[in-house]
């Protein structure tokens, strides 16, 4: 409703690429949801730029994002989670670029945690377990998990296993003996909600036993 930029500023702004991406996190803080957006070009001058979301909200027509360094976010209970919202990059009242987005299709789960590996000597296997906050959530409850592990010396040779539970058994014979392994896990929505992989959990490190010379099995 008032002037924010000189015409020259706006003309310069229109030459820039204001492509952006967003992800939502539902019930990330109690019953609060969050929406995070960022420019795809890290060199965009964000000084006078704001993000605004309109539509598919409760109580208010539009909400302004909060800016923290180079990311923009909202934390609120007021997402309707039905229908599409319009997310715009704005200079004052002028919209530079907008996207219509259903927040249920850009969900990024929280990272799994408490990853651990226990060796079962009698069964000759390793039981991998981890936890996820999504088991307690009302909305994004069903996830697909991606467990990735590698021998520590193999920089980029990750083995991936997809599963819907939070427990995985790795057979001892599939792993190298007397080796140090790194393992980590991430999650993605798998039912109704769509979106992106979570961040990886912190890595867990475990060592496989040596081969028992007499039987050819690991100790």
């Amino acid at each position: 409703e008032s002037g924010y930029a000189q015409n020259g500023d706006l003309e310069d702004a229109e030459l820039d690429d204001y492509s952006f991406s967003c992800y939502s996190q539902l019930e990330v803080n109690g019953s609060q949801h969050s929406l995070t957006c960022a420019f795809e070009d890290p060199d965009v001058n964000t000084t006078n730029l704001e993000f605004e979301i309109c539509g598919a909200l409760v109580e208010v027509k539009c909400l302004n994002f909060r800016k923290l360094q180079e990311i923009y976010f909202i934390e609120t209970k007021k997402f309707l989670l039905i229908g599409k919202s319009n997310i715009c990059v704005k200079v004052g009242e002028k919209s530079l670029t907008c996207k219509k987005i259903d927040l249920t299709t850009i969900v990024k789960p929280e990272a799994p945690f408490d990853l651990s590996v226990i060796y079962r000597e009698g069964a000759n296997d390793f039981v991998v377990t981890f936890n996820t906050s999504h088991l307690q959530k009302k909305y994004v409850k069903v996830l697909m998990h991606d467990v990735a592990y590698r021998q520590e010396k193999d920089e980029n040779k990750w083995t991936h296993v997809n599963l819907s539970s939070t427990k995985l058994t790795l057979l001892q014979r599939k792993l190298q003996p007397a080796a140090m392994y790194e393992i980590k896990v991430r999650s993605i929505p798998d039912h109704y909600f769509k979106g992106f992989w979570s961040e990886w959990s912190p890595s867990y490190y475990f060592r496989t036993p040596e081969i028992n010379n007499s039987s050819g099995e690991m100790d």
Partner: antibody, heavy 122, light 107 residues
């Protein structure tokens, strides 16, 4: 504790100008949208202006648009209302008000100043 | 712009009475409604927001309800300190708007 203290009111002739200030304390001004709301003598409440937390967006009703300008100086913990081309119908107590919720733009107000009286009369 | 119609403009009631004030908006405000109490010479005080959420420190005899375009403030048992003027306010969209007020007087 949260405090909002308005100043700058007084008697002014029609067509004149006045600048109201609101000194705030007890919270981080830069986290909040802020607003001015007025009340003519014996009348109801009327919203006058809102400024976003960043100060980049300002909002006005048609009754004051083009005549009033809201601004803020977060470093000085101050909110301002510059009023130009004043009319008799602008006579009112002017309150500055802070929303309950920080950021985003939920405009319901839990903290109000004591008000400053602006009288526009020849 | 969203128009606000608050009724009644005034009412007389006795201590202990149940009092109901209504606010109607010209379009759906999706529960973006607040209620305030104001006493003479004082700034307004926030009572409720989100149409039905009681602000911290407000007595539980105050309650709010409604959705769409029709909203209600109820005082279940009027107390001496409740004689005041009450305003509704929509914050769904700009321009923000207040109802005309309801003056609650002693019968």
């Amino acid at each position: 504790q949260v405090q909002l203290v308005e100043s700058g009111g007084g008697l002014v002739k029609p067509g004149g100008s006045l600048r109201l200030s609101c000194a705030v304390s007890g919270f981080t001004l830069s986290d909040y949208y802020m607003a001015w709301i007025r009340q003519a003598p014996g009348k109801g409440l009327e919203w006058v202006s809102t400024i976003s937390a960043s100060g980049l967006r300002t909002y006005y009703p048609d009754s004051v648009k083009g005549r009033f300008t809201i601004s803020r100086d977060n470093a000085k913990n101050s909110l301002y209302l510059q009023m130009n081309s004043l009319r008799a119908e602008d006579t009112a107590v002017y309150y500055c008000a802070r929303p309950l919720s920080a950021h985003y733009g939920f405009n319901y107000f839990d903290y109000w100043g004591q008000g400053t009286l602006v009288t526009v009369s020849s | 712009d969203i128009q606000m119609t608050q009724s009644p403009s005034s009412l007389s009631a006795s201590v202990g009475d149940r009092v109901t004030i209504t606010c109607r908006t010209s379009e759906d405000i999706y529960q973006g409604l607040a209620w305030y109490q104001q006493k003479p010479g004082k700034a307004p005080k926030l009572l409720l927001y989100s149409a039905n959420t009681l602000h911290i420190g407000v007595p539980s005899r105050f309650s709010g309800s409604g959705s769409g375009t029709d909203y209600t403030l109820t005082i279940s048992s009027l107390q001496p300190e409740d004689f005041a003027t009450y305003y509704c306010q929509q914050y769904y969209d700009y321009p923000l708007a207040f109802g005309g007020g309801t003056k609650v007087e002693i019968k």
